[in-house]
Interface confidence: low
């Protein structure tokens, strides 16, 4: 359905509040270094213009595309060249090239200071003084640090942020009420951002076929009672929503997401029995709830897959006539029967099935050739099962911090060229899989663990793409989306790596170490551990453990000393010398 004015159409559909929020997010994700006030000014100008178009859709410029309107607005920023350098060249291009250019300049690791949380009373005063500005600032700060954050979901986070302050700023103990809520929002927000980043990478690097395959598998697990045609419809709609959001078309994305939620709630009977409680909620909450809904129960009478996909003499005929639909149906049928498998495993199985049919359907006796295809799945299934089992045992034995350290050593040995901050960030997050997934029942462990690892490894891939330093990382990141995790798991010690020269400065610590939070202390120690491994990649676990134990003892001793700085100055060089000797 075409509209005379796209901007008026979206303003009317979304309402002023959501319209303004989404435009602010869009601008903040494109121009990540611009000050807050500049963005608010641009958003207000766009909103006023949208209102004139609502009043008269034939008014001047109202017929322009959203990309044209938003791009023109962004290109009015006076300091574009000084702040963004070559991104300013985007403004010389015409649409759609200009928008593509802006997208290519999104920075996954912007050079922005970490967000510091003020005192609770200061935050509550700011909230009460100007609630609207306070919430806009939240959208701006999150969006500029996470340029692929799922915009309609960010509006939901902002609503929860507002609710937390509204409740807790009136509480007797404001801090006890507010801080846990803010911690939860921060952790959930980081997870949401990383999950969406994988969806965008999937669409942008591997195409919508890859995303659709992921969606078929995931939705078939969630909605095993839904028919294939129903799942296909949801996949088509969901692909459109995420394509729009990943492409910066945030108004269309939010509008289409609302339509999808409406459709799902109107067609619950043919989708899932689990949607009911989501559908009673207001829009933002409803969409979030639908996205997170638990898997429905599997139908009791599902027949064996072998009849249609192995035993039938018509497998090759069906495959030849409709390859993607036939493979889609195979994936749907397999996924709805296996909520205990990770989506990535299901996609590997579909890929293996496709490869077998490609080979066998050209053979003299196709049926004989593909008769054992399901047997070939066994090693593919056992590999992630064993990986989860071994790593959960290690996690239970070591606890989270030491498990992270084991992964730090493992990954630094695999890809020592990667920057130390990236190795620390990624390995710490890989290590969180233990607490997240290992406590779950057996049937939920693999989908939790492997699909979470895919999200974390995607972060490594996007950071590495910005500054490529390792051919092995490039290979694992670009060859196959579904085989990224097995590719990284299979990497061994990089024998070609020339160890980093020892730099005493890297291992020099000061009294400020003592005032750090527990998390910050861990990061400091883990940074030192990565540097140690880069210096001595062949160091044994025992050697590294000895050095790290000495490090912990040295820090503890100096933090208890009366003159902390003097202790660090005196004991530091001794620790360095002892470490070098231990690793010699």
């Amino acid at each position: 359905d075409t509209h005379k004015s796209e901007v008026a159409h979206r303003f009317k559909d979304l309402g002023e509040e959501h319209f303004k929020g989404l435009v602010l997010v869009a601008f903040s994700q494109y121009l990540q270094q611009c000050p807050f006030e500049e963005h608010v000014k641009l958003v207000n100008e766009v909103t006023e213009f949208a209102k004139t178009c609502v009043a008269d859709e034939s008014a001047e410029n109202c017929d322009k595309s959203l990309h044209t309107l938003f791009g023109d607005k962004l290109c009015t920023v006076a300091t574009l060249r000084e702040t963004y350098g070559e991104m300013a060249d985007c403004c010389a291009k015409q649409e759609p090239e200009r928008n593509e250019c802006f997208l290519q300049h999104k920075d996954d690791n912007p050079n922005l200071p970490p967000l510091v949380r003020p005192e609770v009373d200061v935050m509550c005063t700011a909230f009460h003084d100007n609630e609207a500005t306070f919430l806009k600032k939240y959208l701006y700060e999150v969006a500029r640090r996470h340029p692929y954050f799922y915009a309609p979901e960010l509006l939901f986070f902002a609503a929860r942020y507002k609710a937390a302050f509204a409740e807790c700023c009136q509480a007797a103990d404001k801090a006890a009420c507010l801080l846990p809520k803010l911690d939860e929002l921060r952790d959930e927000g980081k997870a949401s951002s990383a999950k969406q980043r994988l969806k965008c990478a999937s669409l942008q690097k591997f195409g919508d076929r890859a995303f659709k395959a992921w969606a078929v598998a995931r939705l078939s697990q969630k909605f095993p009672k839904a028919e294939f045609a129903e799942v296909s419809k949801l996949v088509t709609d969901l692909t459109k929503v995420h394509t729009e959001c990943c492409h910066g078309d945030l108004l269309e994305c939010a509008d289409d997401r609302a339509d999808l939620a409406k459709y799902m709630c109107e067609n619950q009977d043919s989708i899932s029995s689990k949607l009911k409680e989501c559908c009673d909620k207001p829009l933002l909450e409803k969409s979030h709830c639908l996205a997170e809904v638990e898997n429905d129960e599997m139908p009791a009478d599902l027949p064996s897959l072998a009849a249609d996909y192995v035993e039938s003499k018509d497998v090759c005929k069906n495959y030849a006539e409709a390859k993607d639909v036939f493979l889609g149906m195979f994936l749907y049928e397999y996924a709805r029967r296996h909520p205990d498998y990770s989506v990535m495993l299901l996609l590997r199985l579909a890929k293996a099935y496709e490869a077998t049919l490609e080979k066998c359907c050209a053979a003299a006796d196709p049926h004989e050739c593909y008769a054992k295809v399901f047997d070939e799945f066994q090693p593919l299934v056992e590999e992630p099962q064993n990986l989860v089992k071994q790593n959960c045992e290690l996690f239970e034995q070591l606890g989270e911090y030491k498990f992270q350290n084991a992964l730090l050593v493992r990954y630094t040995k695999k890809v020592p060229q990667v920057s130390t901050p990236t190795l620390v960030e990624v390995s710490r997050n890989l290590g969180k899989v233990g607490a997240k997934c290992c406590k779950l029942p057996e049937a939920k462990r693999m989908p939790c663990a492997e699909d979470y690892l895919s999200v974390v490894l995607n972060r490594l891939c996007v950071l590495h793409e910005k500054t490529p330093v390792s051919e092995k990382v490039t290979k694992c990141c670009t060859e196959s989306l579904v085989n990224r995790r097995p590719c990284f798991s299979a990497l061994e010690l990089d024998e070609a790596y020339v160890p980093k020269a020892f730099n005493a400065e890297t291992f020099t610590f000061h009294a400020d170490m003592c005032t750090l939070s527990e998390k910050e202390k861990q990061v400091k120690k883990q940074t030192a551990l990565v540097e140690l491994v880069k210096h001595k990649p062949k160091a044994t676990k025992e050697q590294l453990k000895g050095v790290m134990d000495n490090f912990a003892a040295f820090v503890e001793k100096c933090c208890k000393a009366d003159d902390k700085e003097a202790c660090f100055a005196e004991e530091g060089p001794k620790f360095v010398a002892a470490s070098q000797a231990a690793l010699a």
């Epitope: 249609d308 018509d314 005929k317 409709a322 639909v325 749907y332």
Partner: nanobody, 115 residues
Framework: EVQLVESGGGLVQPGGSLRLSCAAS????????MSWVRQAPGKGPEWVSA????????RYAESVKGRFTISRDNAKKTLYLQMNSLKPEDTAVYYC????????GSQGTQVTVSS
């Protein structure tokens, strides 16, 4: 998106006839083999008949051979099943599928054969 919508079912006496239709959309109908499948109350799905993409090659389950005829009109994106000499045991929900899968992809149309 892939959509298959069946019609033409109803209540008919033993020995009577019905013609089922299946309107397809969301995919290149003329490139796909199609099937009719049925599911009787309390039973699993049963494959009934299949036709290749061009309409030249047709197959039937033994239970319906000689009584049912599958056909298609690619220009109209429609699949048909002409059912003659109907028997009470033909009572079921009939639905069309892509390829020769017995996986339901649509809501189906009810056929009841009873005196």
């Amino acid at each position: 998106e892939v959509q298959l919508v069946e019609s033409g079912g109803g209540l008919v006496q033993p020995g009577g006839s019905l013609r089922l239709s299946c309107a397809a959309s969301g995919f290149t109908f003329g490139s796909f083999g199609m099937s009719w499948v049925r599911q009787a109350p309390g039973k699993g799905p049963e494959w009934v008949s299949a036709i290749d993409s061009g309409g030249a090659d047709t197959r039937y389950a033994e239970s319906v051979k000689g009584r049912f005829t599958i056909s298609r009109d690619n220009a109209k994106k429609t699949l048909y099943l002409q059912m003659n000499s109907l028997k009470p045991e033909d009572t079921a929900v009939y639905y069309c599928t892509i390829g020769r899968s017995t996986s339901r992809g649509s809501q189906g149309t009810q056929v009841t054969v009873s005196s």
